[in-house]
């Protein structure tokens, strides 16, 4: 089990690091988006895992961004961002087969209503219980 956890961690860390860099290979990214959405978590260790991803990085004074799958829908009443940006993207998470292009990457400011915990502990608990 320890080896499985280590392998899972390495795969997820690499998936986050390479997020959005190859529009032709998005299966792992979309799977991870789905995990974040379902487990209500963000990043592997912490949400800050996303801060080093180039495609999500703001330039200069811009806020750090995280994928929309990190967005905590139940923590906001901002209907504009929900209707126009997030819901259309999150609806896609139910249809993982559909390919995505880099222009489709949905991101929100890290200061917004995102899940506050990383996904690792939840996934590790799941592994221990199965």
């Amino acid at each position: 089990r320890a080896q499985l956890e280590r392998s899972l961690r390495d795969v997820v860390e690499k998936t986050i690091q390479k997020y959005g860099t190859n529009p032709e290979e998005t299966a792992a990214e979309e799977s991870w988006d789905y995990v974040q959405f379902q487990l209500r978590c963000c990043g592997w260790h912490y949400p800050q895992d996303w801060f080093q991803v180039l495609i999500l990085r703001g330039n200069g004074s811009e806020a750090h961004r995280v994928p929309c799958s990190c967005y905590n829908l139940s923590a906001t009443n901002d209907s504009t961002i929900l209707d126009k940006v997030i819901l259309p993207q999150l609806s896609r998470l139910g249809h993982l087969a559909r390919s995505r292009h880099s222009a489709d990457i949905c991101a929100v400011p890290a200061e917004s209503h995102i899940y506050r915990e990383g996904c690792a502990q939840g996934l590790q608990k799941w592994l221990h219980n199965n």
């Epitope: 280590r6 961690r9 390495d10 860390e13 690499k14 986050i16 690091q17 592997w44 260790h45 912490y46 949400p47 800050q48 895992d49 801060f51 080093q52 750090h64 890290a110 506050r116 990383g118 690792a120």
Partner: antibody, heavy 121, light 111 residues
Framework: QVQLVESGGGLVKPGGSLRLSCAAS????????MTWIRQAPGKGLEWVSY????????YYADFVKGRFTISRDNAKNSLYLQMNSLRAEDTAVYYC??????????????WGQGTLVTVSS | QSALTQPASVSGSPGQSITISCTGT?????????VSWYQQHPSKAPKLMIY???NRPSGVSNRFSGSKSGNTASLTISGLQAEDEADYYC???????????FGGGTKLTVL
Amino acid sequence: QVQLVESGGGLVKPGGSLRLSCAASGFTFSDYYMTWIRQAPGKGLEWVSYISSSGITKYYADFVKGRFTISRDNAKNSLYLQMNSLRAEDTAVYYCARDRDRQWLLEFDYWGQGTLVTVSS
Amino acid sequence: QSALTQPASVSGSPGQSITISCTGTSSDVGGYNYVSWYQQHPSKAPKLMIYDVSNRPSGVSNRFSGSKSGNTASLTISGLQAEDEADYYCSSYTSSSTLVVFGGGTKLTVL
């Protein structure tokens, strides 16, 4: 017993570079998350950088981003900090430390003795 | 300017109890239970005294205890001894890009 020994500190001119090393022993190094923390003379502790056990994920304090690079060699049980474009305000004792319990909890149970970096012309 | 606020100094007589506070925000101390406390003697490396707000590592005296209320964490040392004289630092995970924040440190003097 767990031991962390830093080396590589010294006197360097502003704009110069230095590479710090931390040799680990007494535990399975590849299982643990590691960090660099510094302390300017007479001042408090300041977190610098953090690296996952795999070495894939790295975190940096805003004041060192783009200048410092953390890395590790699990085969050699060693942690590194490459410091470029050094400034006078980087003068400090640099400690390497281990995160407790094979987790990423940012709570550090073992520290090295520190290595002094002095940036001065 | 440290992210977490600690008193610069506290003092107490042998046998007394003292408490050191550490005030942050809901983005660090108040929002998570990853608060730790370190003891540092002059020219020595810091030593972990408390982790996860209130847990003691093995080997640390039970005279040291930690707690948290809202955005403020506290370290209490009971039955003060001469060897407790040192600097004490609190630390917390933070949801900002900084990841880890420390307090400015508190110098404990045993009178």
